[in-house]
């Protein structure tokens, strides 16, 4: 069928609550550009019915709710003019919540489950809550460990906790609440939330930074040896990782038989309140097979992405 | 480091009812729920039920259902499992165990208690 | 409920033989939510294998784990003397949590 397939993203969910995923995948959906969704490599779309438990809402897929037997590959292609891509999307559903028992929980927590604050300074936790805009969300009631969160170190703003004077204590196992409305009906949603204590000074926010890039395309020529950098800004001493991945898979696993696409050693310059860290990627010859894919720069929890692109034809030269 | 240390051997009669106890340190108590689990002498492990110290929710198995009460204390970083109307059968180490959030299995054991029901 | 069946009950092998331990489920287990675990006479269990093929920490590399579904492996490689012990296998992925009967690994 002439698409690209892109394999993007491997979603951990829990049943029983709604789940939304919007098929975003810039450069491609930048331009004028049509979103039609499938599951498990089925020719019948995904229905736009919102009346439908799981139906396309412009170019998000949204379950209302989310249930044990959805587990699967979803598709969404997109196409353009004189393109179509086909995104890939492993969404697991997980069936029972972590306050309700430790049984059939999510297992090996993805990044976006762990966040960070920083000791002795005013932090905040963030409540991750992606939906279309039909979906209305209500305000958000946070849980530590099982119980709802009240004292005055704690505000709630928006889709923020913010904790004042963080303490050792503050460690533990949180989760933010919101009451979704779509079409008149309401669903819960209930997110996880694992949360780390750090000694050190924050730079920037409580997350390392990544300077470069920034989630975009380059235009690169086929069978060219192109070196990207990834420049990341991070506190003093942080035991962050930082890894070129692809297919969330580290580099050079990846191609550990080909060496083609290889992580380069680690470089920092030290600031006086912060590092400057720069890993480099190196594709000894750019192959056809590298156009469209995101090659992912992750630094503890932030991750930036490069897709490289092919020039688009020098007309002139005819 | 983890530990978990549970009370001493316990002799009982049977129609009796035994509380063991398991201690928890080097950890954030509250944060990880609590397992115990049958081992009969000669016998595999069979699991028992599950406490959250903070909530104080708690999940059984339907076969140990209404003769076992799981509790804590966590001023003193505790948990408890009373076992009542004991029988022979009922005679084995009991073992406490715990479950971190994101890691659905059991890390980490206490080293045993062992009931003997006899008459 | 999710049931475990092990073989062989009892394995006879010497140091140095490679050991293969089977878990069957009576239903299907997610690789995420099975697990082994090592007993010694009078010791509590310790975990050995989580998620199928993890070893736990400390445990050396001539433990692996595999599997999907229904049928799960452990392969010991090369025996070693303090190898020889009860091998349980266990599933996290529904209630009631259930245990295999369990593999006792003897010196031949």
């Known amino acids: 069928d002439g698409c690209k397939d892109i394999f993007m993203k491997n979603e951990i969910l829990s049943a029983s609550q709604p789940f939304a995923f919007n098929c975003t995948f810039p450069p491609i959906t930048s331009g004028e550009v049509s979103v039609t969704w499938y599951k498990n490599s089925s020719k019948i779309p995904v229905s736009k019915i919102i009346q439908s438990r799981i139906h396309q809402d412009e170019t998000w897929i949204l379950f209302l709710p989310m249930e044990w037997g959805d587990s699967g590959v979803y598709q969404c292609v997109i196409k353009g003019r004189d393109s179509c891509h086909r995104i890939h999307v492993n969404l697991t559903v997980f069936e029972k919540h972590w306050c309700d028992t430790s049984i059939g929980g999510l297992p090996n927590l993805s990044d976006e489950y762990k966040q960070i604050l920083h000791l002795g300074k005013d932090d905040s936790l963030t409540c991750h809550l992606h939906f279309p805009k039909s979906c209305v969300l209500g305000p958000i009631k946070w849980y530590k460990d099982c119980n709802e969160i009240k004292g005055e170190r704690f505000t709630v703003l928006e889709t923020r906790l913010l904790v004042s004077n963080v303490s050792a204590e503050d460690r533990g196992n949180y989760a933010c609440q919101a009451i979704l409305t779509h079409s008149g009906k309401q669903y819960e949603v209930l997110n996880g939330i694992t949360v780390s204590i750090t000694e050190r000074a924050g730079y920037g926010g409580s997350v390392p930074k990544i300077i470069y890039p920034k989630n975009h395309s380059i235009e690169v020529q086929l069978g060219t040896t192109l070196i990207v950098d990834c420049n990341v800004t991070d506190t003093k001493d942080n035991t962050n990782l930082r890894c070129w991945r692809v297919n969330n898979t580290l580099v050079d696993d990846y191609y550990d038989e080909s060496k083609r696409i290889r992580e380069g050693v680690e470089t920092h310059v030290s600031f006086r309140e912060h590092n400057l860290y720069t890993v480099n990627i190196t594709f000894l010859e750019v192959k056809m097979e590298d156009y469209g894919l995101p090659f992912m720069c992750h630094a503890g929890v932030s991750t930036a992405y490069i897709i490289l692109q092919l020039p688009a034809p020098d007309f002139r030269a005819y | 480091q983890v530990q978990l240390v549970q009370s001493g051997a316990e002799v009982k009669k049977p129609g009796a009812s035994v509380k063991v106890s398991c201690k928890a340190s080097g950890y954030t108590f509250t944060s990880s729920w609590m397992h115990w689990a049958k081992q009969a002498p000669g016998q595999g492990l069979e699991w028992i039920g599950e406490i959250h110290p903070n909530s104080a929710k708690t999940n059984y198995n339907q076969k140990f259902q209404g003769r076992v009460t799981m509790t804590r204390d966590t001023s003193i970083s505790t948990a408890y499992m009373e076992l009542s109307r004991l029988r022979s059968d009922d005679t084995a180490v009991y073992y406490c165990a715990r479950v971190d959030y994101g890691k659905p299995w059991f890390a980490y054991w206490g080293q045993g208690t062992l009931v003997t029901v006899s008459s | 409920q999710i049931v475990l069946t092990q073989s062989p009950g009892t394995l006879s092998l010497s140091p140095g033989e490679r050991a293969t331990l089977s878990c069957r489920a009576s239903s299907s287990v997610s690789s995420s939510y099975l697990h082994w675990y090592q007993q010694k006479p009078g010791q509590a269990p310790r975990l050995w294998i989580y998620?199928?093929?993890s070893r736990a920490t400390g445990i050396p590399d001539r433990f692996s784990g595999s599997g999907s579904g229904t049928d799960f492996t452990l392969t010991i490689s090369r025996l070693e003397p303090e190898d020889f012990a009860t091998y349980y296998c266990?599933?996290?992925?529904?209630?009631?949590?259930?245990f295999g009967q369990g593999t006792k690994l003897e010196i031949k």
């Open positions: 266990q599933q996290f992925q529904s209630s009631p949590l259930t």
């Open positions: 998620s199928t093929s």
